[in-house]
Every structure is written in C-alpha cells, then in structure tokens.
C-alpha cells in the first residue's frame, strides 16, 4: 500500500480581515493511525493552531467530522481573521505513539494572506495658527492595512496637491502596515472655509477611497485691515471718528482708542459681522468733543487680534479748523446705532 501523503491543495489563500479562512488538507490513507495538528510556521518556534486530540481552539472549526473512522479530510476554518493571522499554515499527520505521538508527515503548507482595510485617515495640522502667505504642514496617518500597496493623495478644496512626502512602514514583510504623509500648504486670505483632504486608496476599498479632512479655519489667522475715517459732524463741537476692522479671523479681538497717545476707551469685539468668506468685520466709533481740545488731536485705533502684537491706524483731527469742514473721506454705513449721517 502506498505511503500516506498529506495534501494541502492551496498554495495560498487570501482573506479579508473579519472573514473566515478555510485551510484545506486531506490525507491519502487512514494508516498510520494518529491525530492531525495544524501549525503556523515551521521549525521549533511554530505555533499550534489546532490539535485534533486535545485542547480548546475557539476560533477553529473542522470542515468534516474528524471523529468518523474513515475521515480523511482535515480542513479547518479559522474565524474572525485579523492581519496577525497571516503566515504559512501546515497540516501535520502524527502517528500514535507511547508516551507521545510522533510527527509522521507534513503538508507543503498554505500561505494565508490577510487583506485588511486601512483605518480612516486622520489629518492633523500645525499646533499654532499661521497667517496668509505662510506654508504650513499637515500630516495624514492610516494604519492596519494589508497588503502593503497603497495610494495616498492630498487635495485642497478639490485641487490636488503635489508638495508632500509619504512613507509606508515597515519597509520589510509585516502582517500589517501604516502610512504617514506630510503635505505642505500655502495659506491665502480666502482659506477660512478651505479644507485639506487626505485620500487613501487600497485594494480592500473596492475603488471607494477613505478620506480624512482638516478645516483650515483651525489653522489660519487672517489679520485685520484697519481704516480710520472721520464722519460728518453730528453737532457743532462733536466729531464722529470710525475705525473699521475688516476681514479678520478668528473672532478674538480687542480694540483700544487713543487720544494723543492716551487710552480713551477699550472694547472687545462682540457683535461682529461675518463675511461670505468666513472672516469677520467690526466697527467702532469714537465721539470726540472738539471743544475739549486746544490743539490738534491724534486719534489712534489700536487692535490686538488673537493674542498677536497690536496693529494701529491713526487719524489727525484738526481742531483749529471749523468742525463742519472736516469731511468724510470714505463712505460709511449705519451700523445699527441711532446715529445718522448727513444725506
């Protein structure tokens, strides 16, 4: 009679993470009598996966009923596969012995490859805000995928970016891999509503890539532009001076009025106007009693935005001239106060 052969018909098996792997194995003879064991790997460090004779293997089920006398099918199913299960599995026939069974013959092995989806990409930006025209770095990370081949792209508002570097680790063979990419983005004043998107494509995703996003509103600081203008007079001895604080982001802003370098009033922006591009506008006005000043007055609107050094704009108020000759040098608007300008 021909000697028993252990046949593992599948050289390799590819399974998606979370699914069940079927590892096929048949023997060509019932003799010699003895159990079957499954191992991952070969040599002294091999890992026992299933022992027909004894032990508890909750993830493993047999395809056939191994208790039947004439059974020669020793295929197994391993449930809830993870990338850690990847490796070469050997079906090994043992001969009954005393005191221990003796290894008789091994199958050629089946390599189990696990296809694992990448985790949702996580995009993170710089710790501190940056102003327009500056270049900032964004990182994108995704983990736990297999096989190693993966494609990563960066976009800003739908436009693909080219300035980025990507690494897939580890470089050698592994049960699963991670990707790390850093992209450089130049900020513009219009980026409050912008998004940076990291897109990851992998064989496990069936053409439906995963995306991670970062809102540039968390990264950008748009400094305000200031305009100080003198409005037409309300009364013979009063002049209304307006400070327009335009196109700033984020909202945190404090304004101080100075008269000849002395603090006149400090206020915090509360009722701001949101612009279409996501930036904010704010207006403050100062009513100056011209009769209280003997000399010309230098009025300064000083703004501290988002904890940055103060910026300021000044306006010279000529006290010597009759107040009514002090015209407005720009159009202004009714900002909700009960003050009215002259039509």
């Amino acid at each position: 009679e021909e000697e028993l052969q252990v046949i593992q018909p599948d050289k390799s098996v590819l399974v998606a993470a979370g699914e069940t792997a079927t590892l096929r194995c048949t023997a060509t003879s019932l003799i010699p009598v003895g159990p079957i064991q499954w191992f991952r790997g070969a040599g002294p460090g091999r890992e026992l996966i299933y022992n027909q004779k004894e032990g508890h293997f909750p993830r493993v089920t047999t395809v056939s009923d191994l208790t039947k006398r004439n059974n020669m099918d020793f295929s197994i199913r391993i449930g809830n596969i993870t990338p850690a299960d990847a490796g070469t599995y050997y079906c090994v026939k043992f001969r009954k012995g005393s005191p221990d069974d003796v290894e008789f013959k091994s199958g050629a092995g089946t390599e189990l490859s696990v296809r694992a989806k990448p985790s949702a990409p996580v995009v993170s930006g710089p710790a501190a805000r940056a102003t327009p025209q500056h270049t900032v770095s964004f990182t994108c990370e995704s983990h736990g995928f297999s096989p190693r081949d993966i494609t990563l792209k960066w976009f800003k508002n739908g436009n693909e970016l080219s300035d980025f570097q990507t690494n897939v680790d580890p470089v050698g063979e592994s049960v699963s891999y991670s990707i790390h990419s850093t992209a450089k983005v130049v900020l513009t004043r219009e980026d409050v509503h912008s998004q940076v998107i990291c897109e990851v494509a992998h064989v496990t995703l069936q053409g439906d890539p995963l995306r991670g996003t970062a809102n540039l509103s968390e990264t950008i600081r748009v400094p305000p532009t200031l305009e100080v203008t003198q409005q037409p007079v309300r009364a013979e001895n009063q002049v209304n001076v307006t400070c327009q604080v335009r196109k700033f982001y984020p909202q945190r802003l404090q304004l101080t009025w100075l008269e000849n370098g002395n603090v006149s009033r400090t206020e915090t922006a509360s009722t701001v106007t949101e612009n279409k591009d996501g930036t904010y506008n704010w207006m403050s006005w100062l009513l100056v009693n011209v009769s209280a000043h003997r000399d010309d007055v230098k009025l300064t609107c000083q703004v501290e935005h988002d904890g940055q050094p103060a910026v300021s704009k000044s306006h010279d108020l000529k006290v010597s001239a009759h107040p009514k000759e002090q015209g407005s040098n720009t159009a202004a608007e009714n900002t909700g106060s009960n003050e009215r300008n002259i039509y």
Partner: antibody
Framework: EVQVVESGGGLVKPGGSLKISCAAS????????MSWVRQTPEKRLEWVAY????????YYAETVKGRFTISRDNAKNTLYLQMSSLKSEDTAMYYC???????????WGAGTTVTVSS | DVLMTQTPLSLPVSLGDQASISCRSS???????????LEWYLQKPGQSPKLLIY???NRFSGVPDRFSGSGSGTDFTLKISRVEAEDLGVYFC?????????FGGGTKLEIK
C-alpha cells in the same frame, strides 16, 4: 476722496480682445474685494466677475467664463478685465465696483464703454 | 443661477405718494453664514448706480429714512414712504449670496 476710474474701453470687432483697467484711489485697495459689473444697451445690469482682496478667489458669470479674466495688481492699486473672443452681446458699459464693509457695492466708477461690432 | 424678478417694470407715482417695488428670487438667497445679501440700488439718469439698502433692510449711510427694505427667503420689497423728485430713476434689486451674483431687471420710478 474714495474713487475708482475705469479706462481702456473702445470699439472692437467680434472675436477680438480688449483689456480694460480700473485705477483705485483714496482707500486701501489691497484689502477690498472687487467686481466688474456691466450695463447693456437695454440698461440691464449684469455682474461679470469677482476677485478677492488677495486674488485667491475668482468667480465669473457663466456668459463670460473661459473668455474673460479678472486680475489685480495691488502694488499699482489697479483692477483689470481681459476680454477675449468678444461677442456683440458683450457690448456694454463696464463698471468697476468695490465690495464695501458689508460686502455691498459701495463705490462705483463712471464706467467705460465697450462696443463689439463689425 | 438665481433669477431675480422685479415688478413692476415701470412705476408712475405722484410726488409725496408711497411707492413699493417687489423683487422675487427663484430660490432662497440666505447665505450659508445666515445673512441674506439682498441689496437695492438706484440709478439716476446719466449716473452710476448707488447703494440704498443692504442685507434686506439696512439703510446705507446717508440714505433718507423714507426708504425701507423688507422681506425674507425669496420675497423682498423696497418702499419709499413719500416720493421726492430726487428719488426718480431706475431701481435694481441684487443678490450677492450665491455665485453667480444676479440683478433684477429694474423698475423705473417716474412721475405720473
């Protein structure tokens, strides 16, 4: 005094090109969004194109997309509109307008006339 | 595109009368930031248009309080409580909430 002054209009043949300009003065041009608005011979107003203060955002009316290009030179306080593949329907008075504090059109120029005719 | 429809095309009035101009948008013109960028402009003969009302109901600097704007969603109205000679001209509504921005066809306010 806050003002914008358009120039460069004229008579041009269909299919031809023309570049009109808008010189701004009396305000911090580089911090204002700007648009071009035109008025047809029938006196209808049409918004043509928009450019943000830094030039990073640009939008066009469908009727001019691909043919007109809005641009700005903040160092020269000047707004431009490059018009190509001109059609008779582009005949209009072209106004340069400033987007003010609440993003309305608060400053309008006197306009420059563009006539497209063979 | 958002179509802005103005009515009437022509509005003959007597000085001192109230005038009312309607503007209807083909879709909501509430911007994603919550503001409604509906404006009214007046163009007097031989002049460039001038801003009267912004964000539906706010009078621009120097505009007399006889001008008032109202409305929401898609229906907007400009009212002149007592028409004066200097109010004559063509009134345009305008939406600046969604690109492409669009003007209404205009309403000519003239003496009866």
């Amino acid at each position: 005094e806050v003002q914008v002054v358009e120039s460069g209009g004229g008579l041009v043949k269909p299919g031809g090109s023309l570049k009109i300009s808008c010189a701004a003065s009396g305000f911090a041009f580089s911090s204002y969004d700007m648009s071009w608005v035109r008025q047809t011979p029938e006196k209808r107003l049409e918004w043509v194109a928009y450019i943000s203060s830094g030039g990073g955002s640009i939008y066009y009316a469908e009727t001019v997309k691909g043919r007109f290009t809005i641009s700005r030179d903040n160092a020269k306080n000047t707004l431009y509109l490059q018009m190509s593949s001109l059609k008779s329907e582009d005949t209009a008075m072209y106004y340069c307008v400033r987007h003010g504090y609440h993003e309305y059109f608060d400053v309008w120029g006197a306009g420059t006339t563009v006539t497209v005719s063979s | 595109d958002v179509l802005m429809t103005q009515t009437p095309l022509s509005l003959p009035v007597s000085l001192g009368d109230q005038a009312s101009i309607s503007c209807r948008s083909s879709q909501s013109i509430v911007h994603s930031n919550g503001n409604t960028y509906l404006e009214w402009y007046l163009q007097k003969p031989g002049q460039s248009p001038k801003l009267l009302i912004y964000k539906v109901s706010n009078r621009f600097s120097g505009v007399p309080d006889r001008f008032s704007g109202s409305g929401s969603g898609t229906d907007f109205t400009l009212k002149i409580s007592r028409v004066e000679a200097e109010d004559l001209g063509v009134y345009f509504c305008f939406q600046g909430s969604h690109f492409p921005y669009t003007f209404g066809g205009g309403t000519k306010l003239e003496i009866k």
